[in-house]
């Protein structure tokens, strides 16, 4: 659901954080359409999600938290 | 609908532990986030910390972590929270509460009924 | 450890509309939706507006609520006896303390 850079919509699956080693930030204000959440799998894929929905802010604060201890 | 019905009234000594059980019925375990919130005698509301089953992770308010435990038993469909090295301010009401996690809210729609878990020597 | 500020009480007669004021910051209201909840002593907490505005199936419409910037409130029309219980503001908040944050609570009474 993404268009170059930009997402253009969201998944409607639920990602397991276990596939996920990153995130990416996308801001409605900064060229692209929607707010989004990024998520890079290990697969490298890039998924689209709703930074609304409480899984996806799981994940980012999970995503977060290991950073930080790092 | 789903129901949240929790474990009994609990007392224990300082320094020891308590763990809460909160059973769900009526609905599938899949894609719900249960959490725990706590309210102590002329307090307010206190979210403890949250997991979501299918993910099999929790998340704890910094003001717990180290000192609780939240797990899930999906086929029992049963979410716990272990509270450990108890302490007298620890005494107050503990609520499981659901979050529908596919939504685009994260608001507590259903709780249980509560469980007093009292500290005192 | 609450962060998110409101007046300890509020009163109205009945028939009055009160307002309950919650204040936060960028990182929980200021990018978060707002939920409100009504607890009355010795019961579960009740969910009575979600995501700033949004009344669950139940609640009557004399309650709604709004956002704007890092505050949000909760407004009761057309008072009632009933409502006489403790109102929290609750929201995500996106720093690492605690990502589910409450308000400090508003004993509303209804003289």
């Known amino acids: 659901a993404s268009n170059f850079d930009c997402c253009l919509g969201y998944t409607d699956r639920i990602l397991h954080p276990k596939f996920i080693v990153g995130f990416t930030r996308q801001l409605a204000n900064e060229g692209c359409d929607i707010n989004a959440i990024i998520f890079h799998t290990k697969k490298k894929l890039s998924v689209c999600a709703n930074p609304k929905q409480t899984w996806v802010k799981y994940i980012v604060r999970l995503l977060s938290k290991k950073v930080k201890n790092m | 609908q789903m129901q949240l019905v929790q474990s009994g009234a609990e007392v224990r000594k300082p320094g020891s532990s308590v763990k809460v059980s909160c059973k769900a019925s009526g609905d599938t375990f899949n894609n719900f986030a249960i959490s725990w919130v706590r309210q102590a005698p002329g307090h307010g509301l206190e979210w403890v910390g949250g997991i979501i089953p299918v993910f099999n992770t929790a998340d704890y308010a910094q003001n717990f972590t180290g000192r609780v435990t939240i797990s899930a038993d999906k086929a029992t469909k049963t979410v716990y929270m272990e509270l450990r090295s108890l302490r007298y301010d620890d005494t107050a009401v503990y609520f499981c509460a659901r979050t529908k996690i596919e939504l685009d809210n994260d608001a507590f729609d259903i709780w249980g009924q509560g469980t007093m878990v009292t500290v005192s020597s | 450890q609450s962060v998110l500020t409101q007046p300890p009480s509020a009163s109205g007669t009945p028939g009055q509309r009160v307002t309950i004021s919650c204040s936060g910051s960028?990182?929980?209201?200021?990018?978060?939706?707002v939920n409100w909840y009504q607890h009355l002593p010795g019961t579960a907490p009740k969910l009575l507006i979600y995501?700033?505005?949004q009344r669950p199936s139940g609640v009557p419409d004399r309650f709604s609520g709004s956002k704007s910037g890092t505050s949000a409130s909760l407004a009761i029309s057309g008072l009632q006896s009933e409502d006489e219980a403790d109102y929290y503001c609750?929201?995500?908040?996106?720093?690492?303390?605690?990502?589910?944050?409450f308000g400090t609570g508003t004993k509303l009474t209804v003289l």
């Open positions: 995501s700033n505005n």
């Open positions: 609750a929201a995500w908040d996106d720093s690492l303390n605690g990502p589910y944050v």
């Open positions: 960028s990182s929980n209201i200021g990018s978060n939706t």
